[in-house]
Interface confidence: low
Amino acid sequence: FERTRSLQDPCSNCPAGTFCDNNRNQICSPCPPNSFSSAGGQRTCDICRQCKGVFRTRKECSSTSNAECDCTPGFHCLGAGCSMCEQDCKQGQELTKKGCKDCCFGTFNDQKRGICRPWTNCSLDGKSVLVNGTKERDVVCGPSPADLSPGASSVTPPAPAREPGHSPQ
């Protein structure tokens, strides 16, 4: 097992980018190509991540830090450290098991990822629909008819749904 690091432990002197080589009398040896150690005192170097296929390299591996990947055009990252690439869809679509599908009427998606969501129900806030929703955009809620007087603000942002379970339509 690994000895407790102390002033007497030669491995504690090995900096990041090296490893404590037991085969060479615990000399600090540089990490081999395509490997890295991000902290000192390491007994081994870690293999660099390789960004292949749908992944592309955002940051090259160095002796002290791992490579970082992102996704090729048409895909987006999911997970910590871009552990997965998921297919983009167009705005107004959502990704299903059968591919990208248009949002159903009454729903929208303003991203290239994620799912279609119901339009905001303006009436839950006592407002009226100022601009109709589309597949790509939520409705814009305006003031209630009673509020339409000279000098009244004509546009407010889409209102959040007020009560659990109410489906904005």
């Epitope: 303003d110 991203q111 799912i115 959040p160 009560e163 379970g165 109410h166 489906s167 904005p168």
Partner: antibody, heavy 113, light 110 residues
Framework: SLVESGGGLVQPGGSLRLSCAAS????????MNWVRQAPGKGLEYIGI???????YYASSAKGRFTISRDNSKNTLYLQMNSLRAEDTAVYYC?????????WGQGTLVTVSS | DIQMTQSPSSLSASVGDRVTITCQSS????????LSWYQQKPGKVPKLLIY???TLAFGVPSRFSGSGSGTDFTLTISSLQPEDVATYYC??????????FGGGTKVEIK
């Protein structure tokens, strides 16, 4: 990655603003959430902010909590007002609207006199 | 308010056992499938296991699976491993941007 900050000890009735700094991706392209966990308890949902900037809240958070973000700083915020002892929890920011695939390490908020 | 009821609240099983956790929602989740499962190990941050009720998140072992639709959902661990000791949470999403977590299920090894 996501890194929360701004937690600490606050008196009942006080206010606190939590921050969540994102790196490695653009916050504005994602739906972002706040979730909290009281000591020894389960996860409790607070709210979400959409990529277009609209925020939606759990019924328990409406009126006292406000979610916002600064795209230029790639940072998400949670403004908490009129804090109560029962708001004591670890507060997490998390990414995603159909599954939260990336979480911060959390920041502890303690409400006590 | 919408309720997400997880059962059991805790369980103890042997290594290799098949473990099933259920989650019942008081209302139908959005699209019948907007249901996620998370694993939280002691002292750690929650980790996404399953989304869209049955889609395995990247890097999650295939012994985990999810099923169900509408209001009733199940997380199954086909062969329990020591590293699966954790609390598991379901989370439903609903129209109006409502999200609710279940109360959690603590899984231990006998």
């Amino acid at each position: 990655s996501l890194v929360e900050s701004g937690g600490g000890l606050v008196q009942p009735g006080g206010s606190l603003r939590l921050s969540c700094a994102a790196s490695g991706f653009s916050l504005s392209n994602y739906y972002m959430n706040w979730v909290r966990q009281a000591p020894g308890k389960g996860l409790e949902y607070i709210g979400i902010i959409s990529s277009s900037g609209s925020a939606y809240y759990a019924s328990s958070a409406k009126g006292r909590f406000t979610i916002s973000r600064d795209n230029s700083k790639n940072t998400l915020y949670l403004q908490m007002n009129s804090l109560r002892a029962e708001d004591t929890a670890v507060y997490y920011c998390a990414r995603g609207d159909y599954g939260m695939d990336l979480w911060g390490q959390g920041t502890l908020v303690t409400v006590s006199s | 308010d919408i309720q997400m009821t997880q059962s059991p609240s805790s369980l103890s099983a042997s290594v290799g056992d098949r473990v099933t956790i259920t989650c019942q929602s008081s209302q139908t989740v959005y699209n019948n499938n907007l249901l996620s499962w998370y694993q939280q190990k002691p002292g750690k941050v929650p980790k996404l296991l399953i989304y869209y009720a049955s889609t395995l998140a990247f890097g999650v072992p295939s012994r985990f699976s999810g099923s169900g639709s509408g209001t009733d959902f199940t997380l199954t661990i086909s062969s329990l491993q020591p590293e699966d000791v954790a609390t598991y949470y379901c989370q439903g999403g609903y129209s109006g941007w409502i999200y609710v977590f279940g109360g959690g299920t603590k899984v231990e090894i006998k």
